[in-house]
């Protein structure tokens, strides 16, 4: 029985040209995590394997960095980076857990404008 739950950073927004950290956390299970995959829609961004370390997909190599922890840092954001991101935890013996993050990349002026009206 799969008892674990994935907590994520949820829906996040960032400014075009900036960077963002995608993070998930698996809790409520004693299953051993063996690998975490990061995907954007159906495209693989990165893999972190317990024995082999990180592999970043060649198409993202210049603007994706591992960390912090099992998270992923996306740099030099463009509006095309807007969309769903998934962290896929491969565990033993539970199997696979998936978390979802929605990222919206905003034009600089929009991000600045929106920030003025945030509730403290």
């Amino acid at each position: 029985m799969m008892t674990g739950t994935i907590e994520t950073t949820g829906n996040i927004s960032a400014e075009k040209g900036g960077s963002i950290i995608l993070q998930c956390h698996l809790s409520s299970t004693t299953a051993q995590v063996t690998q975490v995959n990061w995907e954007q829609q159906d495209q693989l961004l990165a893999i972190c394997n317990a024995d082999l370390g990180w592999h970043i997909s060649p198409s993202f190599k210049d603007r994706v960095a591992p960390g912090p922890g099992l998270g992923l840092t996306l740099q030099s954001l463009t509006v095309n980076d807007t969309g769903e991101y998934f962290c896929i935890y491969h565990t033993y013996p539970d199997g696979t857990y998936t978390g979802r993050i929605f990222l919206e990349v905003l034009e600089s002026s929009v991000a600045e404008h929106g920030a003025r009206f945030q509730i403290p």
């Epitope: 317990a50 370390g53 190599k61 960390g67 912090p68």
Partner: antibody, heavy 117, light 107 residues
């Protein structure tokens, strides 16, 4: 088995710069973040920053931004840290450490830096 | 920055005893905490990751626990070779930060 070999002790004048190295072996250098940590005599561990050799992406703690520069040479599997504008407060042991699965799992033996006035 | 506080700088224990080293984070770090052991004149050695998982080769007398802001490293059946300083470290966010360390003294 991963292994990190750091360069030897340095005695440097105040105001000068120093560049120390950390040669990695026994694993794929571009698959792991490399971190730098310093320890002053009788004190704790202070994280300086990290670098991902796959694309040289870096992170620094605020106090070392502009003071420490992290680089790598993937052809020789070596990480470097340059520290500028040295003062006596920079005298410490500097460690490089590989970030493995959720911990800094392999550490170099440390490079002792002594800054003289 | 997240501050990791190890309130006890020194702890004294005897061989065979059980001792607990504590670490408090200034904000929620979930279980993104590692523990290290550093013996005099040596580099730090990883003991625990994800707050409670032992690194490879670490004796099972070392146990980590906690989540959120409060973490504990427990050494049961303390041995003379456990004389060392113990550091916690968070990797929830950059910059990574360490606790100030707790030196374990064997009576």
């Amino acid at each position: 088995q991963a292994y990190l070999q750091q360069s030897g002790a340095e005695l440097v004048r105040s105001g000068a710069s120093v560049k120390m190295s950390c040669k990695a072996s026994g694993y794929t250098f571009t698959s792991y973040n490399m971190h730098w940590v310093r320890q002053t005599p009788g004190q704790g561990l202070e994280w300086i920053g990290s670098i991902y050799p796959g694309n040289d992406g870096t992170n620094y703690i605020q106090k070392f931004k502009g003071k420490a520069t992290l680089t790598t040479d993937t052809s020789s599997s070596t990480a470097y840290m340059q520290i500028s504008s040295l003062t006596s407060e920079d005298s410490a042991v500097y460690f490089c450490a590989r970030e493995g699965w959720l911990s800094l799992d392999y550490w170099g033996q440390g490079t002792t830096l002594t800054v003289s006035s | 920055d997240i501050v990791m506080t190890q309130s006890q700088k020194f702890m004294s224990t005897s061989v065979g005893d059980r001792v607990s080293v504590t670490c408090k984070a200034s904000q929620n770090v979930v279980t993104n905490v590692a523990w290290y052991q550093q013996k005099p004149g040596q580099s730090p050695k990883p003991l625990i990751y994800s707050a409670s998982y032992r690194n490879s080769g670490v004796p099972d007398r070392f146990t980590g626990s906690g989540s959120g802001t409060d973490f504990t490293l427990t050494i049961s059946n303390v041995q003379s070779e456990d004389l060392a300083e113990y550091f916690c470290q968070q990797y929830k966010s950059y910059p990574y930060t360490f606790g100030g360390g707790t030196k374990l003294e064997i009576k």
